[in-house]
């Protein structure tokens, strides 16, 4: 199901309501309702690089205003690590790397930088997006997707990999971020929360959405993923927020209806090909973009993130199915599978539209708009 085109003048987090602007003041969660909902502090509140935490160790932050909410350790995801912690964990990922990147979890040991040193890098993902601080960049043209409408056969592999539900995509799905910035899609997966607890990875002005879809792409400049890891622009991810709406989303239902079959960690099923672009918002022209990292080990940097301004609507039942069907390691539910937001450390988030022009209800004081770095020129 494709979404209607968004209102032209309402950036995500701006002043009007509706699926394209879910962040009106009335939607702000209260601290006691959802203590995790606004865990990312503002960039200025974050510690310096030397204080950067391991993935699951939280940054020490200054007390926040009541409106911002507070970060609580007990609200972090606690999916257990696979296997007995006493057992040997020396099986190198793919037998070629020093770190065992198969042994990691959300919300506990081992610290992710021990799994992969890149996880302690300065330019990590996800981040908190502040539309008011985004740099309007007219050079960011509408995204181009080609070959995303797949025929029913051959079928696609849908797997519960213990960290997410992942749909492996076939060759031939081409995406362009702009002239000469061409990619091919590899896979898509989702991040979600738990009952009454949102689980998107990126946040907007501290607001966490119910869920988030990621479509991971490899630059056509590289033949293999391992060649692209850590190279600027080697990988690109399209991300969209999933929100609750009144109707069932028929595109997502093609996947969600099969989750029961892969409830067990490591299980997989085959699903008919579908229109992958129907899982994304319909407006490919309005988005935020920045350079970050993979949000799970190996946390490789140089990843171009494109976060749609428009959201995708799923029914309450569908969001419940997503967050309440799958099981992860150690007989624990696969829930809250998102990484805490990471400091920008001087990075500027760019917007393909004038996101900072519209005054948000929560803009208490004038802000200095960042200048566009002319990405894609």
């Amino acid at each position: 199901q494709r979404l209607p085109r968004m209102q032209e003048d309402s950036p995500l987090g701006g002043g009007s309501s509706g699926e394209d602007d879910p962040l009106g003041e009335e939607d702000l969660p209260s601290e006691e309702d959802s203590p995790r909902e606004e865990d990312p502090p503002g960039e200025e509140d974050l510690p310096g690089e030397e204080d950067l935490p391991g993935e699951e160790d939280l940054p020490e932050v200054k007390p926040k205003s009541e409106e911002e909410g507070s970060l609580k350790l007990e609200d972090l995801p606690t999916v257990e690590a696979p296997g007995d912690p006493q057992e040997p964990q020396n099986n190198a990922h793919r037998d070629k790397e020093g770190d065992d990147q198969s042994h990691w979890r959300y919300g506990g040991d081992p610290p992710w930088p021990r799994v992969s040193p890149a996880c302690a890098g300065r330019f990590q993902s996800p981040v908190d997006i502040r539309p008011q601080l985004a740099a309007f960049c007219p050079a960011l043209r509408p995204l181009e997707l080609l070959g995303f409408q797949l025929p029913p056969l051959p079928e696609l592999r849908l797997r519960n990999n213990g960290h997410s539900v992942q749909l492996t995509l076939p060759p031939g799905l081409e995406m362009a971020l702009g002239p000469g910035r061409e990619y091919r899609a590899l896979q898509l997966h989702l991040h979600w929360g738990a009952a009454g607890r949102p689980g998107s990875e990126h946040t907007v002005e501290g607001h966490r959405f119910p869920a988030e879809i990621h479509v991971v792409h490899l630059s056509t400049a590289f033949a293999r993923v391992d060649e692209a890891l850590g190279r600027p622009g080697g990988l690109a991810v399209l991300a969209a927020f999933l929100e609750e709406g009144p109707e069932e989303n028929s595109a997502y239902e093609q996947l969600l209806s099969r989750l029961e079959e892969i409830a067990e960690e490591g299980s997989e099923t085959q699903v008919p090909g579908l229109d992958i672009s129907a899982l994304l918002p319909s407006d490919f022209s309005r988005y935020f973009q920045y350079e970050g990292s993979l949000t799970t080990p190996p946390c490789a940097q140089g990843v171009i993130w494109t976060v749609f301004n428009q959201t995708v609507m799923l029914s309450a039942k569908q969001l419940h199915t997503l967050s309440d069907t799958l099981w992860g390691p150690g007989d624990s539910r696969l829930q809250l599978n998102f990484r805490a937001t990471q400091p920008l450390n001087g990075r500027v988030i760019e917007a393909s539209f004038p996101a900072g022009v519209d005054s948000s209800p929560r803009a208490a004081e004038p802000v200095q708009l960042n200048s566009c770095l002319a990405a894609g020129d």
Partner: antibody, heavy 125, light 107 residues
Framework: QVQLQESGPGLVKPSQTLSLTCTVS??????????WNWIRQHPGKGLEWIGY???????YYNPSLKSRVTISVDTSKNQFSLKLSSVTAADTAVYYC?????????????????WGQGTMVTVSS | DIQMTQSPSSLSASVGDRVTITCRAS??????LGWYQQKPGKAPKRLIC???SLQSGVPSSFSGSGSGTEFTLTISSLQPEDFATYYC?????????FGQGTKVEIK
């Protein structure tokens, strides 16, 4: 370097259950993304995939053998096992264990990148 | 089940020859195909994955091509150690299935 080693009786009587074990050394069977397979090869013939198991216990069997096959895993011993019931002479084969890795980033299977050396099982009275 | 048909079932060639083995899938398997080499009394060894990616440590004289239903393994210059049986494997959908094999013999 991960290595696989099959073990079990080389001779099984018809109608009985064939039992084989594959021991994984040089790495943990519980590593995420790794699937552990059984494959067989009839004398002078081609290869037939029997099924896989994940450390969580999740399995997938070849439908042609599903009614007779059970694959199990013992993470404490770093082993996985094959049981094939009601065997006949047609089950005489070399049985191999092999590993598949699903890359978390691509979702693509690295199919049968490592194999055991195989063990010959004869079904005969 | 997806049927994998290899041809020829056997061939005779000399050292230095260029050898081509074909594998046909009964339905579209995209590039979800691997090639394996097996010598007598030994376990198979993977040569090619994803239809055309050479396994590390495998001589560059081996190459794979194709996608959809038609796939080819080529040995550009046959070496004495290349005399063996070659199998294709589809891992597009379960049950994963192998071709029946191609035996490459010395002429």
């Amino acid at each position: 370097q991960v290595q696989l080693q099959e073990s079990g009786p080389g001779l099984v009587k018809p109608s009985q259950t064939l039992s084989l074990t594959c021991t994984v050394s040089g790495g943990s069977i519980s590593s995420g993304g790794y699937y552990w397979n059984w494959i067989r090869q009839h004398p002078g013939k081609g290869l037939e995939w029997i099924g896989y198991i994940y450390y969580s216990g999740s399995t997938y069997y070849n439908p042609s053998l599903k009614s007779r096959v059970t694959i199990s895993v013992d993470t404490s011993k770093n082993q996985f096992s094959l049981k094939l019931s009601s065997v006949t002479a047609a089950d005489t084969a070399v049985y191999y264990c092999a590993r598949t890795y699903y890359d978390i980033l691509t979702g693509y299977p690295d199919a049968f990148d490592i194999w055991g050396q195989g063990t010959m099982v004869t079904v005969s009275s | 089940d997806i049927q994998m048909t290899q041809s020829p079932s056997s061939l005779s060639a000399s050292v230095g020859d260029r050898v081509t083995i074909t594998c046909r899938a009964s339905q579209d398997i995209r590039n979800d195909l691997g090639w394996y080499q097996q010598k007598p009394g030994k376990a198979p060894k993977r040569l090619i994955c994803a239809a055309s990616s050479l396994q590390s440590g495998v001589p560059s004289s081996f190459s794979g091509s194709g996608s959809g239903t038609e796939f080819t393994l080529t040995i550009s210059s046959l070496q004495p150690e290349d005399f063996a049986t070659y199998y294709c494997l589809q891992h597009n959908s379960y049950p994963w299935t192998f071709g029946q094999g191609t035996k490459v013999e010395i002429k």
